[in-house]
């Protein structure tokens, strides 16, 4: 014959655990229900009884099966620099992130407790690691032959235009000027911006004068945003 | 002038580690990222990770994130890879670079060949 | 881990030919957060940045190499092809953390 099913509450045989949404009442020295998500244990259970359960009370939760006396309660209201990307319910916390241009600079086990704004670079300066919603950006100077005029956390250095007649040279900080007659553009025109959160971090001494060929090693070149400027600014 | 210096060739049992090193001239080292890349015979690119001189913090390839170690020392303007428990598919020729892909401040060094033999 | 696959794996063609390489993200359209970079590598010779930002020719790269992206797909496009664009061609793009190479497009003399 098949074994009985066991009610809770029930003594578990000698060296048996509970099944699954049972626990092990010490006192009663029972297998006991669990109360579910959203619920927490209002009475607990006797040799006789089983486990009342209660719904948690407004601003509380339980995420898990559980016996808790009490639910949690949940995180206090999102800050003005965050958004509220999961709202405080029965069954679940309240989870905070970062707004864009913003970064989490201290996160917490489900969100972030502190947002940080992104460095912008500062021209002259471009991101070369764009921020993510846990790390802040990084700006570096922007190399020979490209520039970034603008303070952005989400620019990086472009390559200056190439003039047929150059009316005043290029620098880090600007583009090249040239004369009348229609530029040669190394690349096509328009920014591309980093996405936030994106910013920047402290200024860095100027790179070497170009040198008078260009570099015979170029590798990997970045997406195209209109020029970043390399050092970083406080937001 | 612009240059990367690296190490010279290195023949390595499987399970040991190997230390290359790039040393920099022409450019503030902590001005740009250092990369370091590797080739492996008749195959191509493979991307180890950077190093940001400037602080130290690093970036790697999930693949290299247990075994390759990248350090800097600013004060002798040299980039180090460390890649432990080798074995002979890491037989390759790796390059440090200044290469980065938010920039075009692109300059390799000349390739350090890795050799991993029983 | 994401894929960066690049396709054709050889391509022949003649010299005035027109060259059309493609390079696609397994993780889905290539976006501008991907930075999507063409880099040249000749036998015997240092690598050479092309394009960058998906359409942003490097500082000294001739006009008849050009970059441009739609959808999954980043493509670099020779215009007209000169006897020493003859090279093999990886295309790389940004992981939010990490940089992942194409496994090369060689670029043959027909």
């Known amino acids: 014959l098949p074994a009985q099913v066991a009610f809770t509450p029930y003594a578990p045989e000698p060296g048996s655990t509970c099944r699954l949404r049972e626990y092990y009442d010490q006192t009663a020295q029972m297998c006991c229900s669990k109360c579910s998500p959203g619920q927490h244990a209002k009475v607990f259970c006797t040799k006789t009884s089983d486990t009342v359960c209660d719904s948690c009370e407004d601003s509380t939760y339980t995420q898990l099966w559980n016996w808790v006396p009490e639910c949690l309660s949940c995180g206090s209201r999102c800050s003005s620099d965050q958004v509220e990307t999961q709202a405080c319910t029965r069954e679940q916390n309240r989870i905070c992130t970062c707004r864009p241009g913003w970064y989490c600079a201290l996160s917490k086990q489900e969100g972030c407790r502190l947002c940080a704004p992104l460095r912008k670079c500062r021209p002259g300066f471009g991101v070369a690691r764009p921020g993510t919603e846990t790390s802040d950006v990084v700006c570096k100077p922007c190399a020979p032959g490209t520039f970034s005029n603008t303070t952005s956390s989400t620019d990086i250095c472009r390559p200056h235009q190439i003039c047929n007649v150059v009316a005043i040279p290029g620098n880090a900080s600007m583009d090249a000027v040239c004369t009348s007659t229609s530029p040669t553009r190394s690349m096509a025109p328009g920014a591309v911006h980093l996405p936030q959160p994106v910013s920047t971090r402290s200024q860095h001494t100027q790179p070497t004068p170009e040198p008078s060929t260009a570099p015979s090693t170029s590798f990997l070149l970045p997406m195209g945003p209109s020029p970043p400027a390399e050092g970083s600014t406080g937001d | 002038q612009v240059q990367l210096v690296q190490s010279g060739a290195e023949v390595k049992k499987p399970g040991a580690s190997v230390k290359v090193s790039c040393k920099v001239s022409?450019?503030?080292?902590?001005?740009?990222?250092i990369h370091w890349v590797r080739q492996a015979p008749g195959q191509g690119l493979e991307w180890i990770g950077r190093?940001?001189?400037?602080?130290?913090?690093?970036e790697y390839a999930p693949n290299f994130q247990d075994r390759a170690t990248m350090t800097t020392d600013t004060s002798t303007s040299t980039a180090y890879l460390e890649l432990s428990s080798l074995r002979s598919e890491d037989t390759a020729v790796y390059y440090c670079?200044?290469?980065?892909?938010?920039?075009?401040?692109?300059?390799w060094g000349q390739g350090t060949t890795v050799t991993v033999s029983s | 881990e994401a894929v960066v696959t690049q396709s054709p794996a050889t391509l022949s063609l003649s010299p005035g030919e027109r060259a059309t390489l493609s390079c696609r993200s397994s993780?889905?359209?290539?976006?501008?957060?991907?930075?999507a970079n063409w880099v040249q590598q000749k036998p015997g010779q240092a690598f050479r940045g092309l394009i960058g930002?998906?359409?942003d020719r490097a500082p000294g790269i001739p006009a008849r190499f050009s970059g441009s992206g739609s959808g999954t797909d980043t493509t670099l496009t020779i215009s007209s092809l000169q006897p020493e664009d003859f090279a093999v061609y990886y295309c790389?793009?940004?992981?939010?953390?990490?940089?992942?190479f194409g496994g090369g497009t060689k670029l043959e003399i027909k």
């Open positions: 670079s200044t290469w980065d892909g938010f920039s075009y401040f692109d300059y």
């Open positions: 022409g450019f503030n080292i902590k001005d740009f990222y």
């Open positions: 190093v940001d001189p400037e602080d130290g913090n690093t």
């Open positions: 993780t889905g359209p290539v976006t501008t957060n991907n930075y």
């Open positions: 930002g998906t359409n």
């Open positions: 790389a793009l940004w992981y939010r953390n990490h940089w992942v």
